[in-house]
């Protein structure tokens, strides 16, 4: 007896942080005996939708003419061959910006920081959210924060990055969002550049060097400063 | 779960040498800093050495710098702590720890000592 | 190097008090003030991180607050295997640097 049809891989095009009335499109790959693909959003009817495979038959494409608050949330997909329906894909989360007006991100006390010192990332809104991300632009994971540590609705979240190196440098923005809907962002904010600079005593980049001179770890970008992955927007640490 | 298990400690002469490993499982080690921390009997927590993710990046505290080599095997999981000219002042409980990158070291090995005594 | 001073060495309370535990820096550390617990074992845990921040897995009855250069560890409600020695560590600026250690002994 054959084992449970391979499971398909479901993606979006350009991407799955679509900006509000931008078009995106998901496709869903099974294998080349599909006859039928279907997607399925959480907390919708199911099927949510269904298409014919196009040809060679090994893929589906589902488009979104205009991203809405609609479209925001967790898909996955499957396809029907001879023998039957596959397994679910892995979830697919798509987040729509654009939900609210824009936060506001800062840099404490400056965004000129030595490196071997702590430097803390501040994003403010206007109204109470209860959620607060940060990215940094062309980083591998390109969404890189945790939700915020607290569940109450707050103007402000703070994201400490200790100890800093160049790695750090780089342009920022920051969202915010209810939790009610981990798929609704707001306006990003404004850019922040984050420029390290080597220690006054030595701004020489070295390989090896004692604290008394400079000091800061950390290859990878950002980690988390909160205890519950943000929906759709989790760093890959673990 | 995250693990880290030290290993290589014992009983060193002055100026003598050793090498201390971690075992990391449980996460991407490749994608986190490392630590190494020591604890003198009946003393306090002293930072030690510090090592990057990718090994770019390298820090000592004063009183071990020039005698103590920080390094990692990322595929094989382990952090190293090549220590040499050994003093009977490094005799202590030697921890490696993972950093958070925001200030702080989430999870500790349980420790390896080392003893530097003739 | 920045100093960290735990002035209270030894702290002995009743199951169920509310123990504090002080911690001063020489020189304001922008809340980057994180705890540790080191149990007689010498099992070493974070529990609070950014002055104020539980680590996961963490009691809630574990609590930190301050700034600038004060910071205090707040158990609200002492249990027995809250027993152990507690550290404080700055993660301002390198080298990272610890308090002595308080030891919290059952009355």
């Known amino acids: 007896q054959a084992g449970p049809l391979p499971k398909p891989t479901l993606w979006a095009e350009p991407g799955s942080v679509i900006s509000w009335g931008n078009s995106v499109t998901i496709w869903c790959q099974g294998t080349l005996e599909a006859r039928e693909y279907r997607l399925d959003k959480e907390e919708s009817p199911a099927p949510w939708d269904r298409q014919n495979p196009l040809e060679p038959k090994n893929k589906a494409r589902f488009s979104i003419p205009s991203m809405t608050e609609d479209y925001a949330g967790r898909y996955r997909c499957y396809y029907r061959s001879p023998v039957g329906w596959s397994q679910p894909s892995d979830p697919l989360e798509l987040v729509m910006t654009g939900a609210y007006s824009k936060p506001t991100l800062s840099a404490l006390p400056s965004p000129l920081v030595t490196s071997g010192k702590s430097v803390t990332l501040l994003c403010q809104s206007r109204s109470p959210m209860d959620t607060f991300l940060l990215i940094k632009e062309r980083a591998a994971h390109p969404l890189l924060h945790l939700r915020s540590e607290h569940g109450a609705q707050q103007h402000q979240a703070e994201f400490p990055m200790s100890p800093v190196t160049s790695v750090h440098g780089g342009t920022y923005r920051c969202f915010s969002s209810h939790g009610f809907s981990h798929y609704l962002l707001s306006h990003p904010s404004d850019p922040l550049e984050l420029i390290v600079s080597g220690s006054l005593e030595d701004p020489r980049p070295s390989p090896t060097r004692s604290v008394s001179t400079a000091a800061g770890p950390e290859d990878q970008p950002l980690m988390p400063t909160g205890s519950v992955p943000h929906s759709g927007l989790r760093r890959h640490w673990e | 779960e995250v693990q880290l298990v030290e290993s290589g400690g014992g009983l060193v002469q002055p100026g003598g040498s050793r090498k201390l490993s971690c075992a990391a499982s449980g996460f991407t080690f490749s994608t986190f800093g490392m630590h190494w921390v020591r604890q003198a009997p009946e003393k306090g927590l002293e930072w030690v050495a510090y090592i990057s993710s990718g090994s770019s990046t390298i820090y000592y505290a004063d009183t071990v710098k020039g005698r103590f080599t920080i390094s990692r095997d990322n595929p094989k999981n382990t952090l190293f702590l090549q220590m040499t000219s050994l003093r009977s002042e490094d005799t202590a409980m030697y921890y490696c720890?993972?950093?958070?990158?925001?200030?702080?070291?989430?999870?500790w090995g349980q420790g390896t000592s080392v003893t530097v005594s003739s | 190097d920045i100093q960290m001073t735990q002035t209270t060495s030894s702290l002995s309370a009743s199951l169920g008090d509310r123990v504090t535990i002080s911690c001063r820096a020489s020189q304001d550390i922008s809340k980057y003030l994180n705890w540790y617990q080191q149990k007689p074992d010498g099992t070493v845990k974070l529990l609070i991180y950014y002055t104020s921040r539980l680590h996961s897995g963490v009691p809630s009855r574990f609590s930190g607050s301050g700034s600038g250069t004060d910071y205090s560890l707040t158990i609200s409600n002492l249990e027995q295997e809250d027993i152990a020695t507690y550290f404080c560590?700055?993660?301002?600026?390198?080298?990272?640097?610890f308090g002595g250690g308080t030891k919290l002994e059952i009355k």
């Open positions: 720890a993972r950093s958070t990158g925001t200030g702080a070291m989430d999870y």
């Open positions: 560590q700055q993660g301002n600026t390198l080298p990272w640097t």
